[in-house]
């Protein structure tokens, strides 16, 4: 797949990594994660126009069929290509503990 | 993440595997693929409501933030969790060749 990286819709409009500020309450974690109130989450947001960061052949097919049958086949979607690990400090019966999650923070993005 | 498999929107409305019939022309492959002429493309289509087939912790976060900031954070998206290989008979300068593509047909789906 041609892995175009220039967004035809204008700067910042296409699929890319964004950082979203959130509180533990926002995430629904206030009852089991012990941490300051504000956290940063990296996630993949943005449009997936033709040939932009196509993850694979499937994404290419999907875009071609979306053009032909837009009511049936959705456009490719901006999702994480890989993740960064993050350690959560969790509340436990006996106090607190560390747990590493490998699938929590998006590291980079592509269109699928 | 709780990996719910019952669609709260009604049968067939949530993220699942669909088969879409397409010709080589539809796929934009007529000039380099000899066979098959008609392809049944399996792809992931459907909505991703809360807790439905959440791929990982990231999808859970994304849904929670989408509820709070729908204009900023999109809902999780229905994408392939794995792929089935497919063999294409391709035109070459010297004749034809067989090529296996591992990322062409969706095998199962989840929400990311």
């Amino acid at each position: 797949a041609r892995n175009g990286d220039r967004c035809p819709l204008g700067p910042g409009r296409c699929c890319r990594l964004h950082t979203v500020h959130a509180s533990l309450e926002d995430l629904g974690w206030a009852d089991w994660v012990l941490s300051p109130r504000e956290v940063q989450v990296t996630m993949c947001i943005g449009a997936c126009p033709s040939q932009f960061r196509e993850a694979n052949m499937h994404a290419q097919i999907k875009m071609n069929l979306h053009r032909l049958k837009p009511d049936t086949v959705p456009a490719p979607c901006c999702v994480p290509a890989s993740y960064n690990p993050m350690v959560l400090i969790q509340k436990t019966d006996t106090g607190v503990s560390l747990q590493t999650y490998d699938d929590l923070l998006a590291k980079d993005c592509h269109c699928v | 993440a709780r990996n719910g498999d019952r669609c709260p929107l009604g049968p067939g409305r949530c993220c699942r595997l669909h088969t879409v019939h397409a010709s080589l022309e539809d796929l934009g492959w007529a000039d380099w693929v000899l066979s098959p002429r008609e392809v049944q493309v399996t792809m992931c289509i459907g909505a991703c409501p809360s807790q439905f087939r959440e791929a990982n912790m990231h999808a859970q976060i994304k849904m929670n933030l989408h509820r709070l900031k729908p204009d900023t954070v999109p809902a999780p998206c229905c994408v392939p969790a794995s792929y089935n290989p497919m063999v294409l008979i391709q035109k070459t300068d010297t004749g034809v060749s067989l090529q296996t593509y591992d990322d062409l047909l969706a095998k199962d789906c989840h929400c990311v």
């Epitope: 990296t42 690990p85 400090i89 590291k107 | -």
Partner: antibody, heavy 123, light 108 residues
Amino acid sequence: QVQLVQSGAEVKKPGSSVKVSCKASGGTFRSYAVSWVRQAPGQGLEWMGGIIPIFGTANYAQKFQGRVTITADESTSTAYMELSSLRSEDTAVYYCARGPIIMGYQFGLFDHWGQGTLVTVSS
Amino acid sequence: SYELTQPLSVSVALGQTARITCSGDNIGSHIVSWYQQKPGQAPVLVIYDKSNRPSGIPERFSGSNSGNTATLTISRAQAGDEADYYCQTWDSIGSVVFGGGTKLTVLG
């Protein structure tokens, strides 16, 4: 094998600034939190602040707020610490240290350290 | 701001058990890490989250944490264990806090 290699020793005049670099190799630079910790001669460890390249923002210990700037260049996998308005009490070995991203706290669990950079402030 | 207090020095006979304490208000509800620093070298993480050891750290090193005291325990102390040891946690705003450090001397 993760390695953090720091720039060489510096001698600075009071009132001036110093910028120390820390180049990472053997790991994914942006996936971790990089902190700066200093140690005055014969004294203990003191956290100055840190940066998470993927977030781009730095956090600083209150004591150093306004006087320290921590940056990161992902293209070269290098973190920098600049300390301004130097005084004799800033004479110390400055370490960069890497750890996982810790939800909310962000810095700590320093599993890899640079070799240290001695900064001497003297008139 | 949150403070961690360590004894300046601890002595242990070769082959015996050394215990280094780290006191802080309700430290039992904090995550505590321990670092070993030998003269002229950078610190090394030896214990995190009560009693987890990074790879390469001998089983002789263990940790515990409850109430107002966290403890680093080094069993069967060796001459090579002689070093400064620092505890570390976070304050309420997420800043990293180190204890003042304890010099461990192995006698004999």
